[in-house]
Interface confidence: medium
Amino acid sequence: TVPPMVNVTRSEASEGNITVTCRASSFYPRNIILTWRQDGVSLSHDTQQWGDVLPDGNGTYQTWVATRICRGEAQRFTCYMEHSGNHSTHPVPS
């Protein structure tokens, strides 16, 4: 088992909003849960965009999930990752 490296970034979207993206890379096996949570509760599928789980060329995999949120509420959102029985939570950077 190779645990993922998780990285969260933010970028400007429409006025007052930002897009937050959570990337998981270099993990094996390929089964992974990656989702955005608001106040600890997972967002619905239709408010998130997922990338495919793709091989990254090193025998491991990568994927991403993104959502658009209000800039002033960024602290309420976290990226939740679960892989091979381990999980972690990652905040939106300031």
Partner: antibody, heavy 122, light 112 residues
Framework: QGQMQQSGAELVKPGASVKLSCKTS????????ISWLKQKPGQSLEWIAW????????SYNQKFTAKAQLTVDTSSSTAYMQFSSLTTEDSAIYYC???????????????WGQGTLVTVSA | DVLMTQTPLSLPVSLGDQASLSCRSS???????????LEWYLQKPGQSPKLLIY???NRFSGVPDRFSGSGSGTDFTLKISRVEAEDLGVYYC?????????FGGGTKVEIK
């Protein structure tokens, strides 16, 4: 389920600050969201704020943003709430409570501390 | 803020009776993820509140099956099929769908 043990009663003067603690045991502290709530005698409850112990991230009820500050100490599995510029309106019982998003997929205040009575009096 | 209104304020019951408690929210409390985070708590004198029902109708662990929750949108109900002495106290509804999360004013269930 685990335990949540809150600090003892406080008698403080108007204008002062108080720091309440909520020491936890029996569960993985860093996996949890912990909220603080206020209850004045004979009244209903008000949610103050939550803190995610794993990152220290917080979200506040706007009513309390200038009044409350939440922190955690992961080494002792303890959550803290500092309440500042106290007035008699802040006299209340304050509870810490643990969310249960994993076991039940969305229960807010599943496990509670016993409460801390704060009395603000000159 | 979402205002949660509970009725009645006081509910006198006889042991063994069915009790029905109402909670109405000032706006729809469906979360953006599609769930309705409506909960019921019981607080006995001198104690911390205890969670009874989460997500409208789900009993929390250890809660007897005489407690049931129902409702949708803005109208919710907690029913106690046969009231026992240990059920007496103040019941609060709570919404966790919109920040700030808010409680109702409470319904006191007491002996008639």
């Amino acid at each position: 389920q685990g335990q949540m043990q809150q600090s003892g009663a406080e008698l403080v003067k108007p204008g002062a600050s108080v720091k309440l603690s909520c020491k936890t045991s029996g569960f993985t502290f860093s996996d949890n969201y912990i909220s603080w709530l206020k209850q004045k005698p004979g009244q209903s409850l008000e949610w103050i704020a939550w803190i995610y112990a794993g990152t220290g991230g917080t979200s506040y009820n706007q009513k309390f943003t200038a009044k409350a500050q939440l922190t955690v100490d992961t080494s002792s599995s303890t959550a803290y709430m500092q309440f500042s510029s106290l007035t008699t309106e802040d006299s209340a019982i304050y509870y810490c409570a643990r969310h249960d998003y994993y076991g039940t997929s969305g229960a807010w205040f599943a496990y509670w501390g016993q409460g801390t009575l704060v009395t603000v009096s000159a | 803020d979402v205002l949660m209104t509970q009725t009645p304020l006081s509910l006198p019951v006889s042991l063994g009776d069915q009790a029905s408690l109402s909670c109405r929210s000032s706006q729809n409390i469906v979360h953006i993820n599609g769930n309705t985070y409506l909960e019921w708590y019981l607080q006995k004198p001198g104690q911390s509140p205890k969670l009874l029902i989460y997500k409208v109708s789900n009993r929390f662990s250890g809660v007897p099956d005489r407690f049931s929750g129902s409702g949708s949108g803005t109208d919710f109900t907690l029913k106690i099929s046969r009231v026992e002495a240990e059920d007496l106290g103040v019941y609060y509804c709570f919404q966790g769908s919109h920040v700030p999360w808010t409680f109702g004013g409470g319904t006191k269930v007491e002996i008639k």
